[in-house]
């Protein structure tokens, strides 16, 4: 946030930027939550914007028994491990091929014993508040899944006759770890020492970091004609005198009439 | 480039016997597996056997005792004898490899595949 000065007064201006603002030699460069001519001015909301998606990581391990483990397949760059991811991708493509937040699949690591796949589920969902009962949900459809799978597909005298089979003991899940996104962290984090004062307010969806100083919110102060501002001790209303009225009050409603003021003081003296 | 060529197909009457071979180039016999697939008309691929590098071999119900895989390192090439023929065995035998040592006989576990050799069982 930026405000321009022009004339003899920007000199002073410039060892006046407070807050944490610099002058570039035109205006003070204001820090994120600050504006005004002397970033003097605290912002009434803050951009949180979320991200459009949140991730989800599911480590898990599958025993493959339709392979023979050979040491090639250590090798991330050999045929063999390029030709097993290629058929383990497809496979679990199919597996999980209900599940919308279903994004694929990545081999970590190959090891003895048939062939033991350490291996991420990758899911991803639109952001939504409630977009982690989403991918809570989409990881227990991935669990029952998974299970159904290698308790189905495993081996009939030797041979298996799907596209992968399994032990249907080795499958374990290892560890979840869903991206998080707390608006409201970030949004006390970011109002730093206003923390106490700005809150996070939905709209359509969407996350707003605001203080009662921002209008057209539930939490929004009316200041009336008068202006409110932020201060260490909370948002306050800034009363107007116009040309007829005295304001007061601690949301401006209070309006005394300049004339009644002055005529009392005119019968006094 | 793995390049499998298929040969030895043709008529046979019930009950004789054909050897189909397959020549590979690009893909060495001493890792992997290989297989013979068959698919006959209006019928979806399926699994004849399977010869892996470690030795181990593996044959669908329907062709126990009656067929025999086998493969010669040094030329490259797979074998299939087929004894026994029955007018069911009719089908395009395709030849198929992996570099993964395979105990898989469903097509979708496969990667190369050749262009296949007609065999007729008819009287």
């Known amino acids: 946030r930026t405000t321009t000065c022009f004339g003899d007064g920007c000199q002073n201006t410039a060892s006046r930027c407070k807050n944490g603002g610099t002058w570039d030699g035109l205006k003070c460069q204001c820090p994120n939550l600050y504006y005004g001519e002397l970033c003097e001015e605290v912002v009434s909301s803050i951009d949180i914007g979320p991200p459009e998606t949140i991730s989800a990581q599911m480590e898990l391990t599958v025993t493959v028994t339709s392979v023979k483990f050979t040491e090639e397949l250590k090798n991330h760059s050999s045929q063999e491990f390029q030709e097993f991811k290629q058929t383990f991708t497809e496979q679990m493509n199919i597996v999980y091929s209900g599940i919308p937040e279903y994004v694929g699949v990545n081999i970590t690591k190959l090891r003895l014993g048939s062939v033991v796949v350490e291996h991420d589920v990758l899911l991803r969902t639109k952001y939504t508040p409630e977009y982690k009962t989403v991918l809570d949900n989409a990881t227990e459809v991935v669990k029952e899944k998974i299970t159904k799978v290698t308790t189905q597909q495993i081996m009939i005298n030797d041979i298996c006759s799907d596209m992968m089979c399994f032990n249907t003991t080795g499958t374990q899940v290892q560890n979840i770890t869903v991206t998080q996104y707390d608006p409201e962290e970030d949004c006390r984090k970011m109002a730093k020492e206003y923390g106490d004062y700005f809150v996070v307010e939905y709209r359509d969806q969407k996350p707003y970091c605001i203080s009662p100083c921002e209008p057209g919110f539930s939490v929004s102060k009316n200041c009336n004609l008068g202006k409110c501002q932020m201060s260490l001790s909370g948002p306050q209303c800034l009363c107007v005198t116009t040309e007829t009225h005295w304001y007061s009050g601690e949301t401006c409603n209070q309006g005394t009439q300049k004339s009644l003021v002055y005529g009392h003081h005119h019968h006094h003296h | 480039e793995v390049q499998l060529v298929e040969s030895g197909g043709g008529l046979v009457q019930p009950g004789g016997s054909l050897r189909l071979s397959c020549a590979a180039s690009?893909?060495?016999?001493?890792?992997?597996?290989m297989s013979w697939f068959r698919q006959a008309p209006g019928k979806e691929r399926e699994g004849v056997a399977i010869?892996?590098?470690?030795?181990?071999?593996g044959y669908a119900d329907s062709v126990k005792g009656r067929f025999t895989i086998s493969q010669d390192n040094a030329k490259n090439s797979l074998y299939l004898q087929m004894n026994s023929l029955r007018a069911e065995d009719t089908a395009v035998y395709y030849c198929?490899?992996?570099?993964?040592?395979?105990?898989?006989?469903?097509?979708?576990?496969?990667?190369?595949w050749g262009q296949g050799t007609m065999v007729t069982v008819s009287s």
């Open positions: 198929a490899a992996s570099f993964l040592v395979l105990r898989a006989l469903n097509p979708k576990a496969w990667h190369y």
């Open positions: 010869i892996s590098s470690d030795g181990w071999t």
């Open positions: 690009g893909f060495t016999f001493s890792r992997g597996s």
